[in-house]
């Protein structure tokens, strides 16, 4: 999906009002220095691409993020504020239902959510140079 035509300010508002707090709740008890940010993004569409990938694509050691509250709210925000996003996700959602797993908070998941926090911060940060 190409995130270029999303309403970035509306997505930012959704992040600030709820998603950020859900991420903090998920990470509660974890030190901010525990994980190094290894995933980065260069502009808002790129950040959303990386955020979508880390939030919804199962990875080795962390298959359960898509059912977390922050993930559901991220999905809702993208569906509302990114034209055509919902349509591209129908097949992906059906595939997810088939391989639904029990929610387990592993260290790998905590690391992944730490990366997500960094990506969201970059999505929101003011530009220093005009793109």
């Amino acid at each position: 999906y190409d995130f270029t035509n999303c309403d970035f300010e509306k997505i930012k508002a959704a992040y600030l009002s709820t998603i950020s707090k859900d991420l903090i709740t998920y990470m509660s008890g974890t030190k901010s220095t525990e994980f190094n940010n290894t995933v980065s993004c260069s502009n808002r569409p790129h950040c959303l691409t990386e955020i979508q990938s880390l939030t919804f694509n199962p990875t080795a050691g962390c298959a359960s993020l898509a059912k977390e509250m922050f993930a559901m709210k991220t999905k809702a925000a993208l569906a509302i504020w990114c034209p055509g996003y919902s349509e591209t996700q129908i097949n992906a959602t059906q595939a997810m239902k088939k391989r639904r797993k029990r929610k387990v908070t592993t260290n790998k998941c905590l690391e992944q959510v730490s990366q997500l926090q960094g990506l969201w911060r970059r999505f929101n940060r003011p530009l220093l140079k005009q793109q």
Epitope: L16, N37, W120, R125, P126, L128
Partner: antibody
């Protein structure tokens, strides 16, 4: 715990330059912008500029474009601000400030400030 | 540049009183942040992005507003609230308001 430790007070003569430091700890230095803010005695806060320690990109308040130079030393997690051609108008407390964890437009962490006094 | 005008510049309040400090922007901004600065110390973030309470800030502080008008409310003033309060926005580049000095009667 996030900490910003600034260098001590300085007394400098008009026309001279001064370079102050802001040593960051408790987080990954290159992950957050570093802002610099001026506060003259009894006055409000004035944003000077910001630097991205990751790539040294900077943005300035136009008023300080020719007055301030912002740099970083990634190896020591330290940000620097140099002020040139000092006059009495530059006498102030200068703060470094880091953005919030959620979004960097709000300044959640501040150094203790460096007092610069310009006097003959 | 967006100019932020705070009013009043000085306010005197009694303990337990509810007070509201205002910040007016010269043109519309998306968000406002608020800081408290006590004498001889660095500013402290109180409210970020208009209405979010910063970590460790008492719940008697709240923020609201949109467009060109924003406000900070203290529901029940305490002695320790005596300080200068600044609003702050970052649109094209950051600016701060002139501040409101809160004195306790």
């Amino acid at each position: 715990e996030v900490q910003l430790q600034q260098s001590g007070p300085v007394l400098v003569k008009p026309g001279a330059s001064v370079k102050m430091s802001c040593k960051a700890s408790g987080y990954t230095f290159t992950d957050y912008y570093m802002n610099w803010v001026k506060q003259s005695h009894g006055k409000s806060l004035e944003w000077i500029g910001v630097i991205n320690p990751y790539n040294a990109d900077t943005k300035f308040n136009q008023r300080f474009k020719d007055k301030a130079t912002l740099t970083v030393d990634e190896s020591s997690s330290t940000a620097y601000m140099e002020l040139n051609s000092l006059t009495s108008e530059d006498s102030a407390v200068y703060y470094c400030a880091r953005g919030d964890d959620y979004a960097e437009e709000s300044f959640a962490y501040w150094g203790q400030g460096t007092l610069v006094t310009v006097s003959a | 540049q967006i100019v932020l005008t705070q009013s009043p510049s000085i306010m005197s309040a009694s303990l337990g009183e509810e007070i509201t400090l205002t910040c007016s922007a010269s043109s519309s901004v998306s968000y406002m942040h608020w800081y408290q600065q006590k004498s001889g110390t660095s500013p402290k973030l109180l409210i970020y992005f208009t209405s979010n309470l910063a970590s460790g800030v008492p719940s008697r502080f709240s923020g609201s507003g949109s467009g060109t008008f924003y406000s900070l409310t203290i529901s029940s003033v305490e002695a320790e609230d005596a300080a200068d309060y600044y609003c702050h926005q970052w649109s094209s580049y950051p600016t701060f308001g002139g501040g409101t000095k809160l004195e306790i009667k």
